[in-house]
Amino acid sequence: EVEKTACPSGKKAREIDESLIFYKKWELEACVDAALLATQMDRVNAIPFTYEQLDVLKHKLDELYPQGYPESVIQHLGYLFLKMSPEDIRKWNVTSLETLKALLEVNKGHEMSPQVATLIDRFVKGRGQLDKDTLDTLTAFYPGYLCSLSPEELSSVPPSSIWAVRPQDLDTCDPRQLDVLYPKARLAFQNMNGSEYFVKIQSFLGGAPTEDLKALSQQNVSMDLATFMKLRTDAVLPLTVAEVQKLLGPHVEGLKAEERHRPVRDWILRQRQDDLDTLGLGLQGGIPNGYLVLDLSMQEALS
């Protein structure tokens, strides 16, 4: 807390300029008018203030705006944003995407800080949903952003936003998140056809149920093994050998290299060995000939 002292004669700041870097903390407090600072915030970034001096400037703004800064000030905070606490940011009402971009730019190249997380949360809540332009912006700065959201938060993502998602944005998503995003992607891309559709939906297939995989197997999509390995095990298990062959196309040969890994391993255990042999890949571990297969899950559903 800076003591209240009178401003020395002739030192009263008429504008925010470079001369202020030579002011001591108490002089900044005494000689810089908070309203002047607020109207000339855009100049602060160009002046090499010390961290201590920035603390004083923040203090002046806090006094001027105890209920939270207006957006006209927030947009020009620049490096002063790094001085803000999540508690400060919770008082803000940020509605402009330009403001969000400006503040994210300040933090660029760093991990998502608690301040940035709070800012994004405030912004998205203010908009009511995670629209395409916002998602575009956030994933540009933080590719893993989408996967940092809970399934509940992801549910508010409108399908149009899915067009902005790149495959790498989904790299750290877990199955529960893909379960929410996949139906959104299906809705988003429903006006597309065949191979075009498959290219777009591919990254989201970790959330696809069996029925959809069966439908895709009729489309000659030639799914690669990397995508197949990310499918939900429970969605893959009911697929027949013929369906998997159709789904993978020429990539079916890759099953051999993955036969010890899920979901391939578990799928093999559910297939008749005779059927696996038709692939000619030497896959072993299927159900021997003459054994009766009881689908207990179906039995439970019927009882």
């Epitope: 559709y197 029925e211 959809d212």
Partner: antibody, heavy 122, light 106 residues
Framework: EVQLVQSGAEVKKPGASVKVSCKAS????????VHWVRQAPGQGLEWMGI????????TYAQKFQGRVTMTRDTSTSTVYMELSSLRSEDTAVYYC???????????????WGQGTLVTVSS | SYELTQPPSVSVSPGQTASITCSGD??????ASWYQQKPGQSPVLVIY???RRPSGIPERFSGSNSGNTATLTISGTQAMDEADYYC?????????FGTGTKVTVL
Amino acid sequence: EVQLVQSGAEVKKPGASVKVSCKASGDTFNRYYVHWVRQAPGQGLEWMGIINPSGVSTTYAQKFQGRVTMTRDTSTSTVYMELSSLRSEDTAVYYCAESRIPGYNNFAMDVWGQGTLVTVSS
Amino acid sequence: SYELTQPPSVSVSPGQTASITCSGDKLGDKYASWYQQKPGQSPVLVIYQDNRRPSGIPERFSGSNSGNTATLTISGTQAMDEADYYCQAWDSDTYVFGTGTKVTVL
């Protein structure tokens, strides 16, 4: 034959909420997407939103965002649509409809409930 | 917001062909569906994905979609075809229904 059976007619006061249910009979209901569509008296059809088979993913029409909630109880094969802050303009027949036709990019509504009349009046 | 426009009414004699149009910006780039609704009843899907017919729908119902217009054609129209018809398409984040067309069989 597959049927969607909806809950009975409701009369509500402005500002209240209504929760309409939609229960399937005759097939594995939990495999399909369910839409909700409404129709005001003498008016056309208006889509409200959709819920996926497992119930974890919903998409609502912008107009109803923040006012509508769709949920699913897979154990009873029932889908629910709750609309809050009711006003007189919400007086309508509310339909649930399923997308049962197979297809990776198809959401056509081929099985419909009988409709539930919700009247909002003071 | 996206809009689908249909003629309010279409009249047709029994046995003749009825054509109902549905206009929307670049509608041909989207899949169109058509629903039939008789008074006091729930809608019934008659065409999906532009031109596919669900099982149980008579062959006299057909559909097409290109440019800015989707068309539902009922050939050899019967008295039982008298109903309201709605087109529908997905745009951005919502399903949009057309304004509806009342088909009267004279």
